[in-house]
């Protein structure tokens, strides 16, 4: 808390500019009008204030807007955003994607902080669903964003948004999340032809049921082992040796190296030995 002191003669700020950078904390408190600060927030970011000085500026805005900042101020917070607590952010109503982008830019290159997580939560809840533009933006800043959502939250993702998802965005998703995303992806890409469809759907196949894997095995897709190893065990078990051979194509030889790992291990144990022998890989059921 900065003590209330009178502004020294001649130091009253007429605008937010560099003249303030060598003001002491108490001078900033006494000499900068909060309403002036709010209308000239866009200037703050260009001026190299210290963290301590930013604390004072935040305190002034908090006094001016006890119920939460208006979006016109939020959009121009810049580095002052790093000073906000999740409690501060919960008071905000952020509706503009441009505002979201501006604040994510400030945190760029860093882990997702509690502040950013709260901001995103407020934004998405305000929109009612995770639309394509929002998802595009969030995954650009945080490739793991999608996989940080619960299955319930993912259920609000419209299929049209799936076009924004890149393979790396799904790297940390668990099967429960892929179970939700896969049907959406299937719907989103349904009008694509075979080979193009497989390229797009491949990252989502960890949520695919057996019947879809059987269908893919009829399309000469040549699934790589890395993708196969991420498939649901319960979806792989009913597949026949012939279906797995067609599904993997030339990659079928890779089964030998993975024979001790799920789902390959469990699948091998379900097969008849003479069927496995047709692969010529020495797999033992």
């Amino acid at each position: 808390e900065v003590e209330k002191t009178a502004c020294p003669s001649g130091k009253k700020a007429r605008e937010i500019d560099e003249s303030l950078i060598f003001y002491k904390k108490w001078e900033l408190e006494a000499c900068v009008d909060a309403a002036l600060l709010a209308t000239q927030m866009d200037r703050v970011n260009a001026i190299p204030f210290t963290y301590e000085q930013l604390d004072v500026l935040k305190h002034k805005l908090d006094e001016l807007y006890p119920q939460g900042y208006p979006e016109s101020v939020i959009q121009h917070l810049g580095y002052l955003f790093l000073k906000m607590s999740p409690e501060d952010i919960r008071k905000w109503n952020v509706t503009s994607l441009e505002t979201l982008k501006a604040l994510l830019e400030v945190n760029k290159g860093h882990e997702m902080s509690p502040q950013v997580a709260t901001l995103i939560d407020r934004f998405v809840k305000g929109r009612g669903q995770l639309d394509k533009d929002t998802l595009d933006t969030l995954t650009a800043f945080y490739p793991g964003y999608l996989c940080s959502l619960s299955p319930e939250e993912l259920s609000s993702v419209p299929p049209s948004s799936i076009w924004a998802v890149r393979p790396q965005d799904l790297d940390t998703c668990d099967p429960r999340q892929l179970d939700v995303l896969y049907p959406k992806a299937r719907l989103a890409f349904q009008n694509m032809n075979g080979s193009e469809y497989f390229v797009k759907i491949q990252s989502f196949l960890g949520g695919a049921p057996t019947e879809d894997l059987k269908a893919l095995s009829q399309q000469n897709v040549s699934m790589d082992l890395a993708t196969f190893m991420k498939l649901r065990t319960d979806a792989v078990l009913p597949l026949t040796v012939a279906e797995v051979q067609k599904l993997l194509g030339p990659h079928v030889e890779g089964l030998k190296a993975e024979e001790r790992h799920r789902p390959v291990r469990d699948w091998i144990l379900r097969q008849r030995q003479d069927d496995l022998d047709t692969l010529g890989l020495g797999l033992q059921g």
């Epitope: 950078i21 060598f22 190299p48 204030f49 210290t50 963290y51 580095y79 400030v106 760029k108 290159g109």
Partner: nanobody, 126 residues
Framework: QVQLVESGGGVVQPGRSLRLSCAAS????????MGWVRQAPGKGRELVAG????????YYADSVKGRFTISRDNSKNTLYLQMNSLRAEDTAVYYC???????????????????WGQGTLVTVSS
């Protein structure tokens, strides 16, 4: 650590010119802001002119606009203040001040530190 040494002050008649220099040594490759700050007798410190590296802009106090010019010679690590048409109210101790960051990155972190010179006195008197 950063050391700043000012020179060029002195007694000058109104309407004449002076050029102040500030030689910087130490770790100033990560400067964000370099400026000239003056303190008149019995008054507070006032930023007169500054160079903002982050915004790539120059600042001048209203009272010196059109008369003072700040510049920097990177090769000599020296900051200058060219003062023309000096007035009695320009009489003050002039300090060179630098604000640096622990690391300069394009995203402009705020862990900043101030360094000051010892000051050079400028007296404008007839």
């Amino acid at each position: 650590q950063v050391q700043l040494v000012e020179s060029g002050g002195g007694v000058v008649q109104p309407g004449r010119s002076l050029r102040l220099s500030c030689a910087a040594s130490g770790n100033i490759f990560n400067w964000f802001y370099m400026g000239w700050v003056r303190q008149a007798p019995g008054k507070g410190r006032e930023l007169v002119a500054g160079i903002n590296r982050g915004a790539n802009t120059y600042y001048y106090a209203d009272s010196v606009k059109g008369r003072f010019t700040i510049s920097r010679d990177n090769s000599k690590n020296t900051l200058y203040l060219q003062m023309n048409s000096l007035r009695a109210e320009d009489t003050a101790v002039y300090y060179c001040a630098v604000r640096t960051g622990d690391s300069y990155t394009s995203d402009y972190r705020r862990d900043l530190h101030d360094y000051w010179g010892q000051g050079t006195l400028v007296t404008v008197s007839s």
